[in-house]
């Protein structure tokens, strides 16, 4: 081909090339052509004679301006066709005369302003068509039934001001699973408006001003409809009554979307006449209060999203949004409840009661004051079900004994971020029989025993990152319980002394965090006692990373029990020398870092057994001597290797001797060196 | 199952000193403290000590400390009690003991070793 | 040292009946409080672990509760088997100790 396009299994890409007309020479077999991000401005019929075979064009973001009626004659198998973004302002009756196996036309941002007769009446297989972002003033596509196929009709940001029943007939035959008006200054609802399509699922009316008094109409409308989703966001309801979802009572409404409205006054009972909704968006709102009853009825609600639902309007403290005790009692289906990002004070007593199917919870960052957890706090949640609870984010200081005791089904507890700062004697656990994932991470100090776990046996992942860890080298070791965990981060926590049993028993182990600390005292041959062999047994190890410890020795035998280490992190200490079979038993190695150290020689006897099947090697910004002692056989194995090795060209530099400084290393010239090949 | 079988009675004159043993079966010996607990004739129980099979580490209860040496063979999965410079009121009964899962309990007891001390 | 304290030393009572014994920490042990059964010449046997939570394969006539400093340990119904000798044991800081004992006896 002289034009640039790329071929690929049937698919040309000719999208970005400046192009003024189709290209001629493209295999004839192909199915998908992108044309987009040109400079077209027509598209002639005969040019597509030659891709007989298409089933998809696209021509989005060109100039073109008129439309052949021949070019769908010239694809009789096109059932895609693309035109947005082009200038495209009149549709007659011929223009898609022809194009009678389309399944998605999509005229998105042209200049259509009005559309006249029927230009859409043969498209009896069409199942989206995306007219959004023209100048349409009203919905009429047409003056005889047709399109029923049509499942999605996308009609958002145009100037549509009514909903008529005599525009909206012609899909009197077809069932439309989402008709799309957001972004439209819709004013009226005409009677009979939704009931002259034959049947409306979903109907989005986002960025709507629809206010409380038109989202009424609009309810009463939709009545003896069969929609299911509504969609309501930035409509500007700033209040709901008993009265303002009536008409909804009529309907098997099961989605609706009330997010970013300013909803201020949620009163008792608005819901009422919601029993089969399962799905309810209400985030980014300002809900003042909670009542008791403003949930009343929403028996069937799965998940519900309050996130940045109860914000403070101002510092003052009685400004706070209130939510009444039972408030969620009428949710006897929820599963998933977002309440992140709020300025809700506390927990109180009977704030979740009633939810006795709820799985998921999200606390994050939702709480004004909640610096103590006491054993009172979940109380509300002793019958709920819940797998999950996220509870970042809230200045928490302090957990006390119990505090999750009500959670008895509790898999994944997420305390990170927060400032809790305490002695963990175990009892903060009790009760979590069946807890997999404590999330403990960025807090202010912990400091451990050798119960603090000691409850908790069935814990498989254990985040203990940057909290200031005290007390990590007691023996027993605090860790000793958790003989199931596969995972465990105690990264960024500046360990100094730590004993060679600290992870003794975890033969599940899979991966181990310590990066960030300072551990190089242990592995020093000057250590009292000899080197301290912390990572012996973890015959499961997949992932260690000990990045920035300072380590400037390691011991030969310290990685003798990793039979299965994949991934080991190395990186920014200050090793020089590694002892000759330090990774002889890492035969599944795939990855190995030792980016910034100070090694000069990357000897066969050292590296071989650990390079030998790796996917991955990063030894960037090392000081390599290049002579042939310290690199030959390095460099005749990154020539021949096939293991990748990010930035080789810019970021292996020779620091020796010096005439060889600043000089690549894989330039290096091994052929006056003797016995340096790689590969035997 | 686990089990942990100790060695016979003993028989030991003041001054002397006695060693016990444990020996571990039916689980991995080095993956749990094995701990030391003796029992005066008509007396209760009192808690000795503890030592890591795997690394010979020990805590120790202060009021035995001089006295007691707590050692293990892994080769043989088998712990230890020596108790040095015997008293009359060492004659007891010398049991060692194991946690579980759950480290707060012990579910697991040898048979117990009485040692009597007499002149 | 966390000091035990139990009570009573012993106790007369008669099968069927409901018997409580009550164990004192001098210090705050949380719920690691351990109980015994012991029977003349063998090994003492669990009970109860974390102060209420009841050992497999004992009978659920056996029961414990407390936190903290003060914990019991009721036998709901004695049955002639349960005349034996009891003892607490705490978890929380070496030395574990053990309080003196409470010996069950039949009236």
């Known amino acids: 081909s002289t034009t640039k396009c790329t071929v690929s299994h049937e698919v040309a890409d000719c999208s970005h090339l400046k192009l003024t007309q189709v290209p001629d020479d493209l295999p004839t077999n192909i199915t998908v052509l992108n044309l987009t991000h040109n400079q077209l401005r027509r598209l002639p019929a005969a040019n597509f004679t030659r891709y007989s075979q298409l089933t998809s064009l696209d021509v989005g973001f060109n100039t073109i301006s008129k439309l052949e009626p021949e070019l769908c004659q010239k694809l009789p198998m096109l059932k895609v066709l693309n035109l947005q973004h082009n200038e495209l302002s009149q549709l007659s009756d011929k223009t898609f005369a022809f194009c009678t196996n389309l399944t998605e036309l999509h005229l998105m941002s042209n200049s259509i302003q009005k559309i006249k007769n029927n230009p859409f009446v043969k498209q009896k297989n069409l199942i989206t068509l995306d007219l959004s972002h023209n100048g349409l003033s009203s919905t009429k596509l047409g003056t005889q039934v047709q399109l029923e196929n049509l499942q999605e009709l996308l009609l958002s940001n145009n100037k549509i001001q009514a909903l008529k029943s005599e525009e909206l007939d012609i899909f009197a035959n077809s069932s439309l699973k989402k008709l799309e008006l957001s972004s439209n200054q819709i004013k009226e609802f005409s009677p009979g408006c939704f009931h002259a399509i034959g049947r409306l699922f979903g109907l989005f009316l986002n960025n709507v001003q629809l206010g409380p008094s038109l989202t009424e109409k609009l309810c009463l409308e939709l009545a003896n409809t069969s929609i299911r989703n509504l969609s309501l966001s930035n409509s500007q309801l700033s209040t709901t009554s008993n009265t303002t979802f009536l008409g909804l009572k009529w309907t098997n409404l099961t989605m609706l979307d009330l997010s970013y409205n300013n909803l201020n006054v949620v009163g008792n009972d608005s819901f009422a006449w919601l029993p089969q909704l399962e799905y309810f968006f209400l985030e980014y709102n300002n809900i003042q209060h909670l009542f008791s009853h403003s949930l009343h009825g929403l028996f069937n609600v799965r998940y519900l999203n309050l996130k940045r639902s109860f914000t403070k309007q101002s510092i003052s403290l009685a400004s706070l949004p209130k939510i009444d005790d039972f408030s969620f009692q009428w949710l006897k289906c929820l599963e998933h409840l977002n309440m992140e990002d709020n300025d809700i004070p506390g927990i109180k007593s009977n704030m979740f009661t009633g939810l006795i199917n709820l799985k998921y919870l999200s606390l994050s960052n939702s709480f004004t004051s909640l610096r103590t957890l006491t054993n009172e706090t979940f109380v509300s949640l002793a019958h709920s079900p819940l797998h999950i609870l996220n509870l970042t984010k809230n200045k928490i200081s302090k957990i006390e004994s119990d505090a999750f005791s009500w959670l008895g089904h509790l898999e994944v507890l997420d305390l990170g971020l927060n400032e809790i700062g305490q002695e963990l004697t175990g009892q903060e656990w009790r009760g979590l029989e069946n807890i997999f994932e404590i999330y403990l991470s960025y807090n202010k100090y912990l400091q451990l025993t050798r119960n603090s776990f000691a409850l908790v046996p069935s814990l498989q992942r254990l985040m203990l990152r940057r909290v200031a860890l005290k007390n990590v080298d007691s023996s027993p070791s605090p860790f000793q319980p958790l003989r199931n965990l596969t995972i465990l981060d105690l990264s960024n926590n500046n360990i100094a002394n730590i004993n060679d049993d600290m992870l003794e028993g975890l033969e599940k182990l899979e991966i181990l965090d310590l990066q960030h600390n300072n551990l190089a005292r242990l592995w020093k041959h000057a250590n009292p006692g000899g080197p301290i062999y912390f990572l012996k047994g973890l015959s499961h190890l997949h992932i260690l990373n000990l990045e920035s410890n300072g380590f400037d020795e390691i011991p030969v035998e310290v990685f003798k029990d990793l039979f299965e280490l994949k991934i080991i992190d190395l990186g920014l200490n200050n090793l020089n020398t590694l002892p000759a079979s330090v990774f002889n038993n890492q035969v599944s190695l795939k990855s190995l870092n030792l980016q910034k150290n100070l090694i000069t020689s990357v000897e066969k006897k050292v590296f071989g057994p650990a390079f030998r099947n790796l996917t991955e090697l990063d030894m960037r910004f090392n000081p390599f001597d290049c002579t042939c002692e310290s690199i030959a056989w390095f460099v005749n194995w990154i020539n021949e290797t096939h293991t990748n090795i990010p930035e080789l060209s810019s970021h292996y530099l020779c620091n020796t001797p010096p005439h060889y400084h600043g000089f690549p290393v894989r330039l290096f010239d091994t052929s006056s060196c003797k016995d340096s090949a790689p590969f035997e | 199952q686990v089990q942990l079988v100790q060695s016979g009675a003993e028989v030991k004159k003041p001054g002397a000193s006695v060693k016990v043993s444990c020996k571990a079966s039916g689980y991995t010996f080095t993956t749990y403290w094995i701990h030391w607990v003796r029992q005066a004739p008509g007396q209760g129980l009192e808690w000795m000590g503890e030592?890591?099979?795997?690394?010979?580490?020990?805590n120790y209860n202060e009021k035995f400390k001089t006295r007691v040496t707590m050692t293990r063979d892994t080769s043989i999965s088998t712990a230890y009690m020596e108790l040095s410079r015997l008293r009359s009121d060492d004659t007891a009964v010398y049991y060692c003991?194991?946690?579980?899962?759950?480290?707060?309990?012990?579910?697991?007891w040898g048979q117990g070793t009485l040692v009597t001390v007499s002149s | 040292d966390i000091q035990m304290t139990q009570s009573p030393s012993s106790l007369s009572a008669s099968v069927g009946d409901r018997v409580t014994i009550t164990c004192r920490a001098s210090g705050n042990i949380h719920n690691y409080l351990a109980w015994y059964q012991q029977k003349p010449g063998k090994a003492p046997k669990r009970l109860i672990y974390?102060?209420?939570t009841l050992a497999d394969g004992v009978p659920s006539r056996f029961s414990g509760s407390g936190s903290g400093t003060e914990f019991t340990l009721t036998i709901s119904s004695l049955q002639p088997e349960d005349f034996a000798t009891y003892y607490c044991?705490?978890?929380?800081?070496?030395?574990?100790?053990f309080g003196q004992g409470t010996k069950l006896e039949i009236k």
């Open positions: 044991q705490h978890f929380w800081s070496t030395p574990f100790t």
């Open positions: 974390n102060a209420k």
């Open positions: 030592i890591n099979p795997n690394n010979g580490r020990i």
């Open positions: 003991a194991r946690v579980g899962v759950m480290i707060t309990t012990f579910p697991y």
